[in-house]
């Protein structure tokens, strides 16, 4: 039930996360299931446990097996299982199916290929990308953070893509590779200069002091899946995260919707316990894509309590 498949190549780093995650700070114990032997936590070991992570630095074929992780508390232990398989490196260029991560699809307008599992590792840019063992070269290919962007995707771009990066652990470097298939969708999409549907430009939003308020920034960017489109809020020209007011938060992640076939995004700004000083701020809804940036400004005003007359 709480089991997860993980795989890697011999002599590469492999990091596995416990499938039963607790909140941060809980004690996690790891065991090799076949022998019930505890995995050490000392980093001098080739295989060691580090909280919710199990690290093989580097991995060996003999490490294959089922590992048990137990997130511990005196009243409620939560057990998970990591089914780890380490394979010998192939001498030819073919990547067997059992080494492939999930397939991703792209189109002419959207061609991001994320490097699988990379978030578990301590790596630094840039990533190296390969297709059929050939290093990707040319201006059409751009390694950006943890993903590859292909400009002007064509059907010939379909295939198996391998990302390669270096994991650093206490000054020692270990290589990691991961491969996934990329398919190309024939999508007659297009991209527009952002159109903000809400809020209206210079809108005045009535709020009640002491209550919570939500502002939604909603914009459309064209038809079909969009590449590099975003909506966000700013306060007095500053990013929400940099503004430093914990009562005012952007909703995590952007909701994507398709309105009349258009690709739209919205971002909710939540203001908890509205205060007088919030009425003095300028709230900017920003929508941006490759065409440019559009901004709509909102200000808050105090909602007057309704007078009840008989």
């Amino acid at each position: 039930k709480f089991s997860k498949q993980s795989w890697g190549l011999e002599n590469e780093a492999l990091i596995v996360r416990c499938p039963r995650q607790g909140k941060p700070s809980y004690t996690v114990d790891w065991y090799y299931s076949q022998t019930n032997k505890s995995i050490p936590t000392q980093e001098r070991n080739r295989v060691f446990a580090s909280g919710q992570l199990l690290k093989f630095l580097p991995a060996a074929v003999a490490d294959s097996g089922i590992y048990t992780c137990i997130v511990r508390s005196p009243t409620f232990n939560r057990t998970g299982y990591a089914n780890v398989t380490i394979y010998k490196k192939q001498s030819d260029c073919n990547v067997p199916d059992y080494l492939m991560y999930s397939t991703v699809s792209g189109s002419e307008k959207n061609s991001k290929i994320y490097c699988p599992t990379i978030d578990l590792y301590n790596w630094t840019a840039p990533l190296e990308w390969f297709k059929n063992c050939q290093a990707l070269q040319g201006s059409r290919y751009r390694a950006h953070k943890s993903f590859l962007v292909i400009d002007n995707v064509m059907t010939e771009d379909a295939g198996d893509y391998t990302c390669k990066f270096i994991h650093n652990e206490n000054g020692a470097n270990y290589s990691v590779t991961a491969t996934r298939s990329f398919t190309v969708k024939d999508e007659q999409g297009f991209s527009l200069f952002p159109v903000i549907g809400a809020p209206a430009q210079n809108e005045i939003k009535e709020v009640e002091i002491g209550k919570n308020a939500n502002l939604t920034c909603s914009a459309c960017f064209g038809k079909g899946t969009q590449f590099l489109a975003a909506v966000l809020w700013q306060l007095n020209g500053t990013k929400i995260t940099d503004f430093g007011e914990p009562r005012i938060q952007q909703e995590e992640g952007q909701n994507q919707s398709f309105s009349n076939g258009l690709a739209c995004l919205d971002m909710v700004l939540r203001i908890a316990d509205v205060k007088e000083e919030d009425l003095l701020l300028q709230y900017d809804c920003l929508a941006l894509n490759l065409h440019g940036l559009r901004r709509h400004t909102v200000r808050l005003s105090r909602k007057n309590p309704i007078d009840h007359h008989s």
Epitope: S25, Y26, T27, R72, S73, P74, T75, F76, R78
Partner: antibody, heavy 117, light 111 residues
Framework: QVQLQESGPGLVKPSQTLSLTCTVS?????????WDWIRQPPGKGLEWIGY???????YYNPSLKSRVTISVDTSKNQFSLKLSSVTAADTAVYYC??????????WGQGTLVTVSS | DIVLTQSPASLAVSPGQRATITCRAS??????????MHWYQQKPGQPPKLLIY???NLESGVPARFSGSGSGTDFTLTINPVEANDAANYYC?????????FGQGTKLEIK
């Protein structure tokens, strides 16, 4: 988003059995976690009644154990509380909640149960 | 059962000031490097809301004005600076063993 909602009669006669149901939406109760009942007499503090884990194991507060049963209806994604032989001292707001490890991170809004003839 | 005793029973603090609530356990709730003490906030007519877990870890979405400390039998919840919206009852809860128990609560009023 996980949501919990208590339901059941608001008035129970002394010596009868109090029965409450908690309906969970947004998560299958047999997938993981523990599912609690907690009560709060008017103007007083919180008392943990017990919980049932996703595996079906139950843990009860010894002070109530002889009178308490917590069970699950998987088909409706509900869990229930039965408290027998009630007295006026059982009058309280009854909450259902979800426990992840040690803490209740999602709660219902609570339902007031009054024990009176 | 582990008995949790909170003090004070109530306190009044001005906005911008510091509020400190303590919780004392009848026996240690710490083991294996963790302290199994947690804090909740309850406003009138609402269910409790988790603030702090394992003595000092801030629950996701809770403002950094709230902090917890302590180990063994003595624990503290601190709110600094206090805001008007913090008026509520605060409860400690342990999970060192069954049964899980709560403190009797501390009422925080804003002057």
């Amino acid at each position: 988003q996980v949501q919990l909602q208590e339901s059941g009669p608001g008035l129970v006669k002394p010596s009868q059995t109090l029965s409450l149901t908690c309906t969970v939406s947004g998560y299958s109760i047999t997938s993981d976690y523990a599912w609690d009942w907690i009560r709060q007499p008017p103007g007083k503090g919180l008392e943990w009644i017990g919980y049932i884990r996703y595996s079906g194991d139950t843990y009860y507060n010894p002070s109530l154990k002889s009178r308490v049963t917590i069970s699950v209806d998987t088909s409706k994604n509900q869990f229930s509380l039965k408290l027998s032989s009630v007295t006026a001292a059982d009058t309280a707001v009854y909450y259902c909640a979800r426990t992840m490890m040690d803490t209740m991170d999602y709660w219902g809004q609570g339902t007031l149960v009054t024990v009176s003839s | 059962d582990i008995v949790l005793t909170q003090s004070p029973a109530s306190l009044a603090v001005s906005p911008g000031q510091r509020a400190t609530i303590t919780c004392r356990a009848s026996k240690s709730v710490s083991t294996s490097g963790n302290s199994y003490m947690h804090w909740y906030q309850q406003k009138p007519g609402q269910p409790p809301k988790l603030l702090i877990y394992l003595a000092s870890n801030l629950e996701s979405g809770v403002p950094a004005r709230f902090s917890g400390s302590g180990s063994g039998t003595d624990f503290t919840l601190t709110i600094n600076p206090v805001e008007a919206n913090d008026a509520a009852n605060y409860y400690c809860q342990h999970s060192r063993e069954f049964p899980l128990t709560f403190g009797q609560g501390t009422k925080l009023e804003i002057k």
